[in-house]
């Protein structure tokens, strides 16, 4: 909608592990920056949302048949790991330096 | 894209190239099956929507703060090519056997 700020982009999302019940096994950190992909995949899809051909096609079909076909969606297209200290199966505190797929690196229209 | 009540799944989407203005350069086919990813990414995320860790986290945060954080989105996670006969830069009919990323192979929650 109004302004570039509403187009698909990465926005802050601080996640507290207590809020999602993961504090029972994640010792540290208490919270982390997960980021969230927010905003619209509007026509015309800009290069910075790295649209697939299918996303471009769907966007064009949506223009003609908006009640039948949805817009493409703004989602994480690349994720980053975080480091966590967690309790293993035996309850032993263990460091996992690369806990993959926890934080958004890039967003795009898919 | 988002759906009302059903869970994230692949649904039919027949695309006519004339409807999106691509008939000016794509000679054949006249239309193709693009498929569309439709439905919601509801808790708990099932294995068949192959959720990333970030999608799981976002889903859990959405449960606690539904007005602040959106659900994960149902999008194509794997695309397939189609074969097209198109006009090249010189207007010569050319066959492209693998025109990548045009049809949904799999949907998931991201």
């Amino acid at each position: 909608s109004t302004g570039a700020g509403s187009h698909c982009q990465k926005t802050s999302l601080r996640v507290n592990f207590e809020d999602i019940g993961w504090n029972s096994w994640i010792i540290a950190p208490k919270e982390y920056e997960a980021y969230e992909c927010k905003g619209g995949c509007f026509f015309p899809l800009a290069d910075d949302v790295t649209p697939t051909k299918h996303a471009i096609v769907q966007t064009l079909v949506h223009l003609k048949f908006p009640t039948k076909v949805g817009k493409a969606c703004c989602v994480p297209t690349k994720l980053s790991p975080i480091s966590i200290l967690y309790k293993d199966d035996m309850g032993v505190p263990t460091l996992k330096y690369h806990y993959e797929g926890m934080s958004v690196a890039e967003c795009g229209c898919r | 894209s988002t759906g009302a009540g059903s869970h994230c799944q692949k649904t039919s989407l027949r695309v006519n190239f004339e409807d999106i203005g691509w008939n000016s350069w794509i000679i054949a086919p006249k239309e193709y099956e693009a498929y569309e990813c439709k439905g919601g990414c509801f808790f708990p995320l099932a294995d068949d929507v192959t959720p990333t860790k970030h999608a799981i986290v976002q889903t859990l945060v959405h449960l606690k703060f539904p007005t602040k954080v959106g659900k994960a989105c149902c999008v194509p996670t794997k695309l397939s090519p189609i074969s097209i006969l198109y006009k090249d830069d010189m207007g010569v009919p050319t066959l492209k056997y693998h025109y990548e990323g045009m049809s949904v192979a799999e949907c998931g929650c991201r």
């Epitope: 909608s1 109004t2 302004g3 509403s6 927010k38 905003g39 619209g40 509007f42 026509f43 015309p44 949506h62 223009l63 003609k64 908006p66 009640t67 949805g70 817009k71 | 988002t2 759906g3 009302a4 919601g40 959106g70 659900k71």
Partner: antibody, heavy 119, light 107 residues
Framework: QVQLLESGGGLVQPGGSLRLSCAAS????????MSWVRQAPGKGLEWVSI???????HYADSVKGRFTISRDNSKNTLYLQMNSLRAEDTAVYYC?????????????WGQGTLVTVSS | DIQMTQSPSSLSASVGDRVTITCRAS??????LNWYQQKPGKAPKLLIY???NLQSGVPSRFSGSGSGTDFTLTISSLQPEDFATYYC?????????FGQGTKVEIK
Amino acid sequence: QVQLLESGGGLVQPGGSLRLSCAASGFTFSSYAMSWVRQAPGKGLEWVSITLGTGHTHYADSVKGRFTISRDNSKNTLYLQMNSLRAEDTAVYYCARGSYIIWSALDYWGQGTLVTVSS
Amino acid sequence: DIQMTQSPSSLSASVGDRVTITCRASQDIRSYLNWYQQKPGKAPKLLIYDASNLQSGVPSRFSGSGSGTDFTLTISSLQPEDFATYYCQQSDTSPLTFGQGTKVEIK
């Protein structure tokens, strides 16, 4: 500054026709979606029709087949051709600019023009 | 079509009160929700776009929140000029649809 000025309203008999115009200024008209929104006396807002910056047009079910939206980008003017008018079409008709090339928030509105359908 | 339901349909409040109006969409519209203010005999005015973004020139006492199907417009401290009717509208897709309106009256 952005300005939208509607004209063409008036009294018309049921079954009659009317053409509304909306003269736009202060922005690149062709780059924005434009809508018509109406408000019956004492009632809420009802979206009527939209023309996207892409040229696509869409209508509310209540006017589909009777109303036609169009735009002349060279004249910076939006139109609404209303045919087969009914008593329930009586309303103030507003022209509104979408904030983007497709459906979006309506960030600027005209002052409205009154259409009365009565015998 | 996406139905928009506002509540309450009317409310009475005093200057300085905190006022909350809610809007519910019949299906997920993510954050494509806008709020308008309309005074008698005048055209509507955009207050909030995309659920939580304040339109330029709108006082900061107005705020919006929500995502998916449930949205809220809050006026933190009601001023005399805020007595009006408020409408929500979804811009997720065509047909665009409005809520039925909430009239804010002086108590």
